[in-house]
Interface confidence: low
């Protein structure tokens, strides 16, 4: 389906507002340090150019690829060398190398100030004064901080952001209406960003075969009534969508995502009975709803898998004829029968099955060799089941904050070389698995927990890739996507680690501690906990608990004092001395 002008094609398909929003997101994800006004100017220039191409597809430069047009535009930024350093060298390259170069310079942890939320009245005034600018600013600020955010989904978030302000800025109690909505959008946005980052890592680091395997497993769980051919078609289309978005081709991605939603809604009968309410919604909500749709009911009469995949004498013949199709069908059949398994477990089972066939189909008696293959699955299934059980028990016993602390200690002992902010961020997020998944019924716990942990550990992997400090982390992150979580779970105390020298400055606190929010106080305390473990990796749980209890008491005492700063100055050194003695 070729078009004389790609930019005109996408402008017409997407409409002006989506086109402009997506171009703004694309530019903000590439040039994360550029000021908002600069990006708006570039987007307006591209949009005006697109309109000339819509009017006349034969006009000058309208036949150029989107990468060429967008790359040329980005390379007009005057301060590229000063602001981005070696990224400016990308502009000396030709497409497609130039785009690859820009992609490689995306920064998962950009040095940007945290977003501060202004007073509600200030936000409502800004919203009413210039709604369009207000919403563009939202797209820009989110996109530059999350350079792999799923762009069409970010438009959905922006729509919800707008709706929240439209409703709440007219409410009697604006803050009570707006703040919970903004908190929800922030938390959902961070989760969405992290999930998409795993999809992009899967495609970029492990190839589209890995992504397709993930998609076969997940879609087979969601759509167990769909035929394998239908699931395969959806997987192919979904892979194209995510490949495009992860590659910075946001216009194509959004267009293809809309086409996929249209296809699914036109073919509901052969996909799932759960799609109906999604398909009644407008475009952005429809695509979001389809992505989040609950699993359909399993067909009642599914036969045992053993007949086709163990007992049949034709297993090796079928496998040899089309390995990927046969393994894909195995994964489909297993996944549709097991919505209670995590996707990562299903992929491990498929991998184990593949390894068994590779070995057995070369053996003297293949059937005898692979006859017990399903028995080999049992330990693979039990490992995540036990892990979820143990951790949910611990979460229920400790509560979220102390559960996070237990994980902080556990992970700092495993990989003490990792930076303290990264350990705090990752462990806090690992700890959120409790509240997210442990309250669910047994059949939903493992898919919730393990697939969430995969997303969080991917964040550790992408941050570590930027600044590699631990061979263990590199090994777990790069060897196998499906075994990342078991790899990290299996890590023990790093005996080779040389404990960090004690630095009193790290444990010096001031009166500003008292004005922090509860979350910020927790982060401060958890930062201190990581530093303690780095200083004394062999400290026992009891020793660490004693120090942390003393710390909490010391902070509480000084925050109640009349002269808070004086209290911190006096009590701080005593706390440090007592802590050193307790850990000696």
């Amino acid at each position: 389906d070729t078009h004389k002008s790609e930019v005109a094609h996408r402008f017409k398909d997407l409409g002006e507002e989506h086109f402009k929003g997506l171009v703004l997101v694309a530019f903000s994800q590439y040039l994360q340090q550029c000021p908002f006004e600069e990006h708006v100017k570039l987007v307006n220039e591209v949009t005006e150019f697109a309109k000339t191409c819509v009017a006349d597809e034969s006009a000058e430069n309208c036949d150029k690829s989107l990468h060429t047009l967008f790359g040329d535009k980005l390379c007009t930024v005057a301060t590229l060398r000063e602001t981005y350093g070696e990224m400016a060298d990308c502009c000396a390259k030709q497409e497609p190398e130039r785009n690859e170069c820009f992609l490689q310079h995306k920064d998962d942890n950009p040095n940007l100030p945290p977003l501060v939320r202004p007073e509600v009245d200030v936000m409502c005034t800004a919203f009413h004064d210039n709604e369009a600018t207000f919403l563009k600013k939202y797209l820009y600020e989110v996109a530059r901080r999350h350079p792999y955010f799923y762009a069409p989904e970010l438009l959905f978030f922006a729509a919800r952001y707008k709706a929240a302000f439209a409703e709440c800025c007219q409410a009697a109690d604006k803050a009570a209406c707006l703040l919970p909505k903004l908190d929800e959008l922030r938390d959902e946005g961070k989760a969405s960003s992290a999930k998409q980052r795993l999809k992009c890592a899967s495609l970029q680091k492990f190839g589209d075969r890995a992504f397709k395997a993930w998609a076969v497993a997940r879609l087979s769980q969601k759509f167990p009534k769909a035929e394998f051919a239908e699931v395969s078609k959806l997987v192919t289309d979904l892979t194209k969508v995510h490949t495009e978005c992860c590659h910075g081709d946001l216009l194509e991605c959004a267009d293809d995502r809309a086409d996929l939603a249209k296809y699914m809604c036109e073919n509901q009968d052969s996909i799932s009975s759960k799609l109906k309410e999604c398909c009644d919604k407008p475009l952005l909500e429809k695509s979001h709803c389809l992505a989040e749709v609950e699993n359909d009911e399993m067909p009642a009469d599914l036969p045992s898998l053993a007949a086709d995949y163990v007992e049949s004498k034709d297993v090796c013949k079928n496998y040899a004829e089309a390995k990927d199709v046969f393994l894909g069908m195995f994964l489909y059949e297993y996944a549709r029968r097991h919505p209670d398994y995590s996707v990562m477990l299903l992929l491990r089972l498929a991998k184990a099955y593949e390894a068994t066939l590779e070995k057995c189909c070369a053996a003297a008696d293949p059937h005898e060799c692979y006859a017990k293959v399903f028995d080999e699955f049992q330990p693979l299934v039990e490992e995540p089941q036990n892990l979820v059980k143990q951790n949910c028990e611990l979460f229920e016993q400790l509560g979220e904050y102390k559960f996070q602390n237990a994980l902080l200690v556990r992970y700092t002992k495993k990989v003490p070389q990792v930076s303290t902010p990264t350990l705090v961020e990752v462990s806090r997020n690992l700890g959120k698995v409790g509240a997210k998944c442990c309250k669910l019924p047994e059949a939903k716990r493992m898919p919730c927990a393990e697939d969430y942990l995969s997303v969080v550990l991917n964040r550790l992997c992408v941050l570590h890739e930027k600044t590699p400090v631990s061979e263990k982390v590199t090994k777990c992150c790069t060897e196998s996507l499906v075994n990342r979580r078991p790899c990290f779970s299996a890590l023990e105390l790093d005996e080779a680690y040389v404990p960090k020298a004690f630095n009193a400055e790290t444990f010096t606190f001031h009166a500003d501690m008292c004005t922090l929010s509860e979350k910020e106080k927790q982060v401060k305390k958890q930062t201190a906990l990581v530093e303690l473990v780095k200083h004394k990796p062999k400290a026992t749980k009891e020793q660490l608990k004693g120090v942390m209890d003393n710390f909490a008491a010391f902070v509480e005492k000084c925050c109640k004092a009349d002269d808070k700063e004086a209290c911190f100055a006096e009590e701080g050194p005593k706390f440090v001395a007592a802590s050193q003695a307790a850990l000696a």
């Epitope: 002006e16 439209a166 909500e285």
Partner: nanobody
């Protein structure tokens, strides 16, 4: 199949009133923002008013503010435009149009009615 059918147009004197209706079918009406758009003879399309899916957010073009009132009845799958203090410059074909996006942020419409003619003349 999505269908939008307008009615209620006609000839009215300046200063008079009319109420336009739009009957919707073939989709879940209560999920969509709806709009009135008009086209004066020999002119381009002009957006007139929009109403959010639940009817809580309403917007008007400056040219009709204070004179026109948009409303909807989701139970009846109907959209309305009450037009008061009509002027000669309100003469146009009035279309009801569905917004494919839930926000009203985007003024691009995926389905239109066939239109109803309103003529304001003495």
């Amino acid at each position: 199949e999505v269908q939008l059918v307008e009615s209620g147009g006609g000839l009215v004197k300046p200063g008079g009133s009319l109420r336009l209706s739009c009957a919707a079918s073939g989709f879940t009406f209560s999920n969509y923002n709806m709009n009135w758009v008009r086209q004066a003879p020999g002119k381009g399309l002009e957006w007139v008013s929009s109403i959010s899916s639940a009817g809580t957010h309403i917007y008007y073009a400056d040219s009709v503010k204070g004179r026109f009132t948009i409303s909807r009845d989701n139970a009846k799958n109907s959209l309305y435009l009450q037009m008061n203090s009509l002027r000669a410059e309100d003469t146009a074909v009035y279309y009801c149009a569905r917004d494919p996006h839930s926000t009203g942020w985007y003024k691009d419409f995926d389905y239109w009615g066939q239109g109803t003619l309103v003529t304001v003349s003495s």
